[in-house]
């Protein structure tokens, strides 16, 4: 009778193992193992008894005693079983990014490992099991569905695997994949609100808004403005829910033209994008022309008015006629003219919108000087001691310098209050002079002298 | 003992395709992976690509990718690697190799190979 | 795709001397799990090839004791400690870490 110790051994990959073979037989013509694993054997007194180290054990076998006595052969087998972690335990790729509401599906591949009969594949969240199966296949393969929550933001995804060796006196051993970090988001299906202006002057400055509501997580939240080619840069601020980006624009002669304004709002692997249209346009304040801005009395003057070739102009009101970009008046300069005020209105349809500008000039008309009764009485009559201001007005453009002299020499003080004496009595000669020439006025000072009784 | 058997050498012409059979024998054939691997004279060893036995899930090289198809009959213990619009530079032999799915413990038995030559 | 490159090309080695073969990777062979797939194969003239190296130094089954591997990141060495008559054929390295699998050039040993 042949037999073997130990007739089972689990041993890791690569192991070896002591096999001791027997015979019940003193006088065994033959005692040996069968086996294609590398063996050595140990020298051992009697010739019923061998021990061999079988190495390099890489896969299960079944090596074999055999003995040959008298009364016969026989053979004895040892369940080697060899045992070895999974080499690959990973989760298939998955975009980090899901949307909440959508079904995740999580396959967890494993290469390797025995024996399977004791390997199970646990797929997990966190520590929570969501599903257990036994190893089967190469790669065994194990999957589950996952509704995403919001509530799943954040949460590790894992698959581990258990080769439970307890049973055979080892112990459990463990293999965890790297984790999947999920990260969840709400988009919602409407579109960010854009805010701007629809025309923009070329050289000037607009606010841009761009706002949305309903976004899981805000923060995660990516927001791109660009006016045409331009990218803007906003202010983001965010709510709970919701941000508001704002953003400066300013455009240039290059941009003119009709420009497409987006905003695009990108969360996880999707994005909400606006589109609008804004007309930058070029429209500089008419041009008011005076022939000379600074004329002598009864010249004639030319105003014209010129704007954009598409805008249409009011000179002081009055419509260009033929309706159109020109204007013009033609007066001839009175010193009523002078300080007159013309005015260009110009109007130019910017995409729907009317859009105006104003530009003033004013007409400087040289005259004088003038010297005249209304404000320059001939003749004054006051009692003596009597409290007086002589009152003389030049007109003129420019005003004129004004000098009232007697015998040339002693002047009435203009404008000033004088206690009149009988000095003061007399003919004036008064003199207005300015660039535009001189005159001169004669007045008279006349001093009654109180009546003694 | 383990053994892989493939089909006899093959001679194409250039366009045509090829039907390579490995046939497994002394495991369970459900437990192992098969890759196909070939040979070109005075190349080095080409990886082409993989199949699961047992679900039938494959992986190809990039190179190889819409002119192999692997696939296998679980019933008769067999894998196939058919080639198509065959060029002359797809001489070789190839190779099915029992393995792991991702061969981290290398390919540890091989067929014997077969010979393909595509000639006009 | 990771290059594999061997050297020498040819090695030529008196019976019963050590022989000593080269690998190296183009990129880390260390996959994220911290494990090495780094293979070492023996092809005989006229035969398929045959594993004896596994994971940069594990004996396949039934391979002589006088075959060991080293090496890691880049850098692998295939060692046999005394060469014998049926050591001689090609040898190659090949990696299973990043995909495509890939195989070194191959080393032909042969007796002097």
């Known amino acids: 009778q042949t037999s073997v110790s130990p007739s089972k051994v689990i041993l890791p990959r690569g192991g070896s193992v002591l096999v001791t073979c027997s015979t019940s037989c003193d006088q065994p013509k033959l005692l040996g193992i069968e086996t294609p694993l590398p063996k050595k054997e140990l020298l051992l007194p009697g010739n019923n008894r061998k021990v061999y180290e079988l190495s390099n054990v890489q896969e299960d076998s079944q090596p074999m005693c055999y003995s040959n006595c008298p009364d016969g052969q026989s053979t004895a087998k040892t369940f080697l079983t060899v045992y070895w972690t999974p080499e690959r335990v990973e989760l298939a790729p998955l975009p980090s990014w899901q949307p909440v509401g959508k079904n995740l599906t999580l396959r967890c591949q494993v290469e390797g490992g025995a024996p399977r009969a004791n390997l199970t594949v646990v797929l997990l969240r966190g520590e929570k099991e969501l599903k257990r199966e036994p190893a089967v296949g190469e790669p065994a393969e194990v999957t589950t569905t996952v509704l995403v929550r919001r509530d799943h933001h954040g949460a590790n995804f894992s698959c581990r695997t258990e080769l439970d060796l307890r049973p055979q006196g080892l112990e459990l051993f463990e293999n965890t994949s790297a984790p999947y970090q999920l990260q969840t988001f709400v988009l919602p299906a409407t579109p960010p609100q854009l805010v701007s202006p629809r025309v923009l002057e070329v050289d000037t400055q607009g606010t841009v808004v761009c706002s949305l509501d309903g976004l899981f997580p805000v923060s995660e939240a990516q927001v791109h403005l660009a006016l045409g080619d331009q990218r803007l840069n906003p202010t983001v601020t965010y709510g709970n829910d919701s941000f508001s980006a704002k953003a400066s624009v300013s455009v240039t002669a290059e941009d003119e033209g009709t420009q497409r304004l987006t905003c695009a709002v990108i969360l996880g692997n999707q994005s909400q994008e606006t589109l609008q249209t804004v007309t930058i346009y070029s429209f500089p304040a008419p041009n008011v022309i005076l022939t000379k801005p600074e004329v002598s009395e009864g010249t004639e003057v030319t105003v014209k008015c010129e704007a954009h070739p598409r805008a249409k102009v009011t000179l002081n009101g009055v419509p260009a006629q033929p309706l159109g970009p020109r204007a013009q008046l033609l007066l001839k300069a009175t010193p009523e003219d002078n300080g007159r005020s013309f005015s260009c209105s110009a109007t130019l349809e910017v995409a729907g919108q009317l859009i105006h500008k104003n530009q003033t000039r004013e007409l400087r008309v040289l005259y004088g000087p003038r010297l005249d009764e209304r404000d320059c009485p001939g003749n004054w009559t006051w009692p003596e001691n009597s409290q007086q201001t002589p009152m003389c007005q030049a007109w003129g453009n420019p005003l004129p310098e004004l000098k009232c002299l007697k015998d040339g020499t002693f002047p009435l003080p203009i404008g000033e209050s004088v206690t009149v004496t009988r000095d003061l009595e007399g003919t004036y000669l008064c003199r207005a002079r300015s660039t535009q020439g001189e005159v001169t006025r004669k007045v008279t000072v006349n001093v009654l002298s109180p009546r003694y009784e | 003992q383990v053994q892989l058997v493939q089909s006899g050498a093959e001679v194409k012409k250039p366009g045509a395709s090829v039907k390579i059979s490995c046939k497994g024998s002394g495991y369970t054939f459900t437990d192992y992976a098969l890759h196909w691997v070939r040979q070109a004279p005075g190349q080095r060893l080409e990886w082409i690509g993989v199949?699961?036995?047992?679900?039938?899930?494959?992986d190809y090289n990039q190179k190889f990718r819409g002119r192999a198809t692997i696939t296998r009959d679980t019933s008769a213990s067999t894998a196939y690697m058919e080639l198509s619009s065959l060029r002359s530079e797809d001489t070789a032999v190839y190779y099915c190799?029992?393995?792991?799915?991702?061969?981290?413990?290398?390919?540890?038995?091989w067929g014997q190979g077969t010979a393909l030559t595509v000639s006009s | 795709d990771v290059v594999l490159t061997q050297s020498p090309l040819s090695l030529p080695v008196t019976l019963g001397q050590p022989a000593s073969i080269s690998c190296r990777s183009s990129q880390t062979l260390v996959y994220r799990n911290g494990n090495t797939y780094l293979h070492w194969y023996q092809q005989r003239p006229g035969q398929s090839p045959r594993l004896l190296i596994y994971k940069v130094s594990n004996r396949f089954s039934g391979v002589p004791d006088r075959f060991s591997g080293s090496g890691s990141g880049t850098d692998f060495t295939l060692k046999i400690s005394r060469v014998e008559a049926e050591d001689v054929g090609v040898y190659f390295c090949?990696?299973?870490?990043?995909?495509?699998?890939?195989f070194g050039g191959g080393t032909k040993l042969e007796i002097k």
């Open positions: 090949s990696q299973n870490t990043h995909f495509p699998y890939t």
């Open positions: 199949i699961s036995t047992y679900s039938g899930n494959t």
């Open positions: 190799a029992r393995s792991l799915y991702f061969g981290s413990s290398g390919f540890d038995y």
